[in-house]
């Protein structure tokens, strides 16, 4: 299987990729020779071989062309070679070797003549056990791979040289490379290609945020001598309207949005809203749908509620209890409240005016959360129209018409207010004379008063009622020395007022008479 070259290696020379002859210098000419061969994947390549194993004193040199250093400080030489076992060649015991030598020479000039003594030895290369088995026919050749480091290199370029001292060897490929920390994106920050130092120190590199992102913490990484990025610090996050996709910040697609900077993903537009363009930070409400000022962008767009339904009025003289049902359509919000608009109208319903400020609403007139209100202190025998508005958080953003239900009523005449005090004028063994004042609010002409009484000890199980035209009465046929309880209420054309509170008076014992005594409860 082909193993791709690591992305952190930059080739300065790769003999496999050179088309045609390599054209390296062989000295002497009958030593290393350029031939056609195959690599470990049976790909045809140009290769150099030498197999002068008969002679004791071999000194065959092969020099590459000049290799530019580029920005490398430390270079790596990867040799793939096949070394023929000396035992497989009869007659050559003693003269055959199984090693060769690797040299280099730095130079600013690429026209340098070959001189052995100018080269510095890198290492003696021997076949080890880390080979790839290559089946050529049924013979297994050992394809060895050896890597050597050279550095620091300072001049503009260098030559490599291979010295054969009597081996049967083929250089299948020569690759010279340096290591870099390759361009990478980490935490949405871009780090450029960086060539490490030759020394053991790490190079600190500042990252730059990818498009459509911003720094959360300043992004940094360290480039090691081995061309590896280490210790990512800090990060960038995608702007509003963009989300992280792989190594980029990608615009939210139409129909999606992202309201704020950060790591969140683009979200689908909430109900009744949409976006037509890429990179939306929020979604626009559809026609006739709205979002309140303080609503988050994630909230669905809503519309005002429909009108309340089934309004029922329950009139009690100059009070009315209004009840209604929840709107059929809430508009998509839960913050529905009701406002009561009160209008006092003439006998022509079109001639209305706002109600007097004296009119009272229980629990209140505006911002009702329940579907009932009691309106009091209305005028008797008056036409009123009540408009019940249903509103929610977006009602004020929509154009009229208002969504309300209306009910018109006419108040009755009000009954009189209670009699406040009852006074005992005279007592006898069988009678009590009482007087009282007219109610503070007669609300019309008092037709008569109803006087209700009973013996205290009988606890209202049996009582007597009598009517008085004026504001006094004498009750007779009572038992002597007995406590009676009295309550009085006034009557007008509108009906009875409420009863007074209870007053207690006693009849006199036998042959005893008292007058002018106030009540006690």
């Amino acid at each position: 299987e082909l193993s791709p070259q690591p992305s952190n290696e930059v080739n300065l020379l790769d003999s496999k990729t050179i088309q045609g002859e390599l054209g390296w210098i062989s000295y002497p000419s009958h030593g290393w020779e350029e031939i056609s061969g195959v690599d470990e994947h049976y790909t045809p390549i140009r290769t150099y071989q030498v197999c002068n194993v008969m002679d004791h004193s071999q000194n065959n040199w092969l020099r590459t062309n000049w290799v530019p250093r580029n920005s490398a400080q430390k270079i790596y030489v990867e040799l793939k070679f096949t070394l023929r076992d000396c035992n497989s060649i009869p007659l050559v015991l003693g003269t055959c070797k199984e090693t060769f030598n690797l040299y280099y020479m730095e130079s600013d000039d690429h026209g340098v003549k070959f001189r052995e003594h100018q080269f510095t030895k890198i290492d003696t290369i021997a076949a080890d056990e880390s080979f790839t088995q290559m089946d050529l026919g049924d013979r297994i050749l050992k394809l060895n791979t050896e890597i050597r480091e050279v550095g620091p290199v300072n001049k503009k370029g260098f030559y490599l040289a291979f010295q054969d001292v009597g081996a049967c060897v083929a250089l299948v490929s020569v690759r010279v490379y340096f290591k870099k920390c390759p361009f990478t994106v980490k935490n949405l920050a871009m780090f450029p290609d960086t060539v490490p130092m030759d020394s053991q120190s790490l190079v600190e590199v500042r990252g730059s945020c990818v498009n459509n992102s911003k720094e959360e913490d300043p992004p940094r990484m360290y480039c090691s001598t081995e061309g590896e990025w280490l210790v990512p610090i800090g990060k960038c996050t995608c702007n509003a309207g963009y989300e992280e996709r792989g190594f980029i910040c990608q615009a939210c697609r139409p129909g999606f949005y992202k309201a704020s900077d950060g790591a969140a993903k683009c979200a689908k537009c909430p109900p009744h809203s949409s976006t037509q363009e890429d990179g939306s930070m929020n979604c626009r409400c559809e026609n006739n749908y709205f979002r309140a000022e303080k609503d988050p962008p994630s909230m669905a767009c809503a519309r005002p509620p429909s009108a309340p339904r089934n309004v029922i009025s329950n009139i009690n003289e100059t009070s009315v209890i209004l009840d209604w049902s929840w709107p059929l359509d809430t508009g998509g919000r839960k913050d529905i409240t009701f406002n009561i608009i009160c209008k006092k109208c003439g006998w022509n319903v079109r001639q209305c005016e706002p109600c007097s400020p004296n009119v009272r609403f229980l629990p209140r007139q505006l911002g009702l959360t329940n579907t009932t209100v009691t309106v009091t202190d209305l005028l008797a025998h008056t036409n009123y129209t009540f408009e019940i508005d249903a509103v929610n958080g977006v009602s004020e953003l929509s154009s009229p018409p208002r969504q309300y239900a209306a009910v018109s009523i006419t108040t009755n005449q009000a009954a009189p207010s209670p009699v406040m005090t009852i006074k005992k004028d005279r007592t006898s063994r069988n009678s009590i004379s009482l007087s009282w004042q007219e109610p503070e609010h007669p609300n019309g002409i008092i037709l008569d008063y109803e006087v209700k009484y009973y013996q205290k000890q009988e606890q209202e199980t049996s009582y007597t009622i009598l009517r008085a035209r004026g504001t006094n009465v004498t009750i007779s046929s009572l038992k002597p020395d007995t406590t009676y309880v009295f309550q009085i209420r006034a009557r007008t054309a509108a009906g009875y007022g409420t009863n007074s509170r209870k007053f207690e008076f006693e009849t006199s014992p036998d042959s005893f008479s008292i007058s002018g005594e106030n009540s006690h409860v």
Partner: antibody, heavy 121, light 106 residues
């Protein structure tokens, strides 16, 4: 250029000996082994063996031991094949051929023109 | 000793045709054989050796392939000068030749 020069035809009686020379030129004689190949009239090629021109160490193929000897004179870059006790069946063209050793396999890349040895009474 | 058997003994082809020569080993051999061409009255000439490498001056219409026990020499388009006898040769501790295949004009 590289070449191997052999002597002309030899006619020998049975039981006699013959020494066939092979003179190399155009390359370092001691850097390449020399092989000997026999071809009887109308027949195929037979490998007889080879000699290490550096050490003089010979190797003989099966059937070519005893009466056949490979030798050298490196001073004149010449290899020799000596056959003793000649027999009629030794009648053949004898070729010297330079050995081509490579990592990937061997062959004989330069051949002499051949020496016809005829054994006849 | 490994025996190399070449087939066919004679191959008749017309110029411009493809010629395929076979060489079979009696047992699995250590590498691809070398191939030689011999014309009447001439010494053999090395065609291909090692890893199917053509010898110096050999045209690229000659190619070799195979592994194990079965090997092939192919002449992609036979030229008039290619009519000759072809030998395969196996090497190792002991070298052996096949008996040869004669390529003649059809």
């Amino acid at each position: 250029q590289v070449q191997l020069l052999q002597s002309g035809a030899e006619v020998k009686k049975p039981g006699a000996s013959v020494k066939v020379p092979c003179k190399a030129s155009g390359y370092t004689f001691t850097s390449r082994a020399m092989s000997w190949v026999r071809q009887a009239p109308g027949q195929g090629l037979e490998w007889m063996g080879w000699i290490n021109t550096n050490t003089g160490n010979p190797t003989y193929a099966q059937g070519f031991t005893g009466r056949f000897v490979f030798s050298l004179d490196t001073s004149v870059s010449t290899a020799y094949l000596q056959i003793s006790s000649l027999k009629a069946e030794d009648t053949a063209v004898y070729y010297c051929a330079r050995v081509r050793l490579t990592v990937y396999g061997d062959g004989m890349d330069v051949w002499g023109q051949g020496t016809l040895v005829t054994v006849s009474s | 000793e490994i025996v190399l058997t070449q087939s066919p003994a004679t191959l008749s082809v017309s110029p411009g045709e493809r010629a395929t020569l076979s060489c079979r080993a009696s047992q699995s051999v250590s590498s691809n054989p070398a191939w030689y061409q011999q014309k009447p009255g001439q010494a053999p000439r090395l065609l291909i050796y090692g890893l199917s490498t053509r010898a110096t001056g050999i045209p690229d219409r000659f190619s070799a392939s195979g592994s194990g026990t079965d090997f092939t020499l192919t002449i992609s388009r036979v030229e008039p000068e290619d009519f000759a006898v072809y030998y395969c040769q196996q090497y190792g501790p002991s070298w052996t030749f096949g008996q040869g295949t004669k390529v003649e004009i059809k």
